[in-house]
């Protein structure tokens, strides 16, 4: 009786079970009653990452520098190339097909989490007692200067965008 299902790493064709090609190889010809499945290794810059019956290998992903991309991990016959973004940029999607410049945190906001090649900068508002007076992708909120520790007094209150201004204490005449 011809089989209706095949073992793992096999496929059914012409009423018989043929071996799939291993990762890194493509199908040249199906098996017969006399020959096994014929497979050939993928060429340079090609890959197949599963047991397969593909007649063509996939092209390695191109990390286009014009899109801010660079190679993070070179592809093999069994794996695709992994792209990442140039310094100061991050991927727009999980597939990392293009990059955008890291977001900067505006004055009044500080960096909660610095951006990576795959995630953008996370900003947070500066709470009371902290400030940020620059637009930056790296700067956290800084604490207001403590005038007391400098034996000074607050002459101008701080905000989320400005530090306090300290001045000398009024002396008793």
């Amino acid at each position: 009786e011809p089989p209706t299902a095949c073992r793992e790493k096999q496929y059914l064709i012409n009423s018989q079970c043929c071996s799939l090609c291993q990762p890194g190889q493509k199908l040249v010809s199906d098996c017969t009653e006399f020959t096994e499945t014929e497979c050939l290794p993928c060429g340079e810059s090609e890959f197949l990452d599963t047991w397969n019956r593909e007649t063509h290998c996939h092209q390695h992903k191109y990390c286009d520098p014009n899109l801010g991309l660079r190679v993070q991990q070179k592809g093999t016959s069994e794996t695709d190339t992994i792209c990442t973004c140039e310094e100061g940029w991050h991927c727009t999607s999980e597939a990392c097909e293009s990059c955008v410049l890291h977001r900067s945190c505006s004055p009044g906001f500080g960096v909660k989490q610095i951006a990576t090649g795959v995630s953008d900068t996370i900003c947070e508002p500066c709470p009371v007692g902290f400030f940020s007076n620059v637009s930056s992708a790296f700067e956290k909120c800084h604490p207001w200067t403590s005038c007391e520790t400098k034996d000074l007094v607050v002459q101008q209150a701080g905000t989320n965008k400005t530090d306090v201004v300290c001045g000398p204490q009024d002396r008793l005449r």
């Epitope: 040249v28 010809s29 098996c31 017969t32 009653e33 006399f34 020959t35 096994e36 014929e38």
Partner: antibody, heavy 117, light 107 residues
Amino acid sequence: EVQLVESGGGVVQPGRSLRLSCAASGFTFSNYGMSWVRQAPGKGLEWVASISSGGDDTYYPDNVKGRFTISRDNSKNTLYLQMNSLRAEDTAVYYCTRAGGKAMDYWGQGTLVTVSS
Amino acid sequence: EIVLTQSPATLSLSPGERATLSCRASQSIRDNLHWYQQKPGQSPRLLINYASQSISGIPARFSGSGSGTDFTLTISSLEPEDFAVYFCQQFNSWPLTFGQGTKVEIK
């Protein structure tokens, strides 16, 4: 018991034709691919032709393609090899073989074909 | 076409000795190789399939190994009936091809 019995061999002149037969018994003939393999006197084995179990697919090496034809009659449990335009280099013992697990798991006793003028 | 080269052409050994026969393929054939034995005046018989799988009814002293391009048939201890010619055959792709054979003769 699996049995393969070849017949039809003999002496033939170059350019002439000959038809070999192989009578199969002891197994379900229609379930198996079949092949012909030959062996020139004192030489090694050479694959000549193969045919799928249903008879739809046939396979030949380049040196016999267009001259030899493999066929089968599943109702008669018989395999054939029609050999045309015979040459001196076709002189050999011709074996009928069964394809089991992609191997030639059973062989006939062989029939001698001599191509000579 | 895949060319199979067997070595040595002739192996002269005594009964009880170990025989090691080699078959080399011109390109990788994975484990798609069979071994056959042919005694004088007889038809070939299948000994090993898929490079290393034993065949029912074949004595355990016959074993096969190898994958890719290099294959070995080993007869652990030669019996008088083992003196014969041994052929390898590839079934990785068309055309099916055989090695030229190794003759194991009595020393």
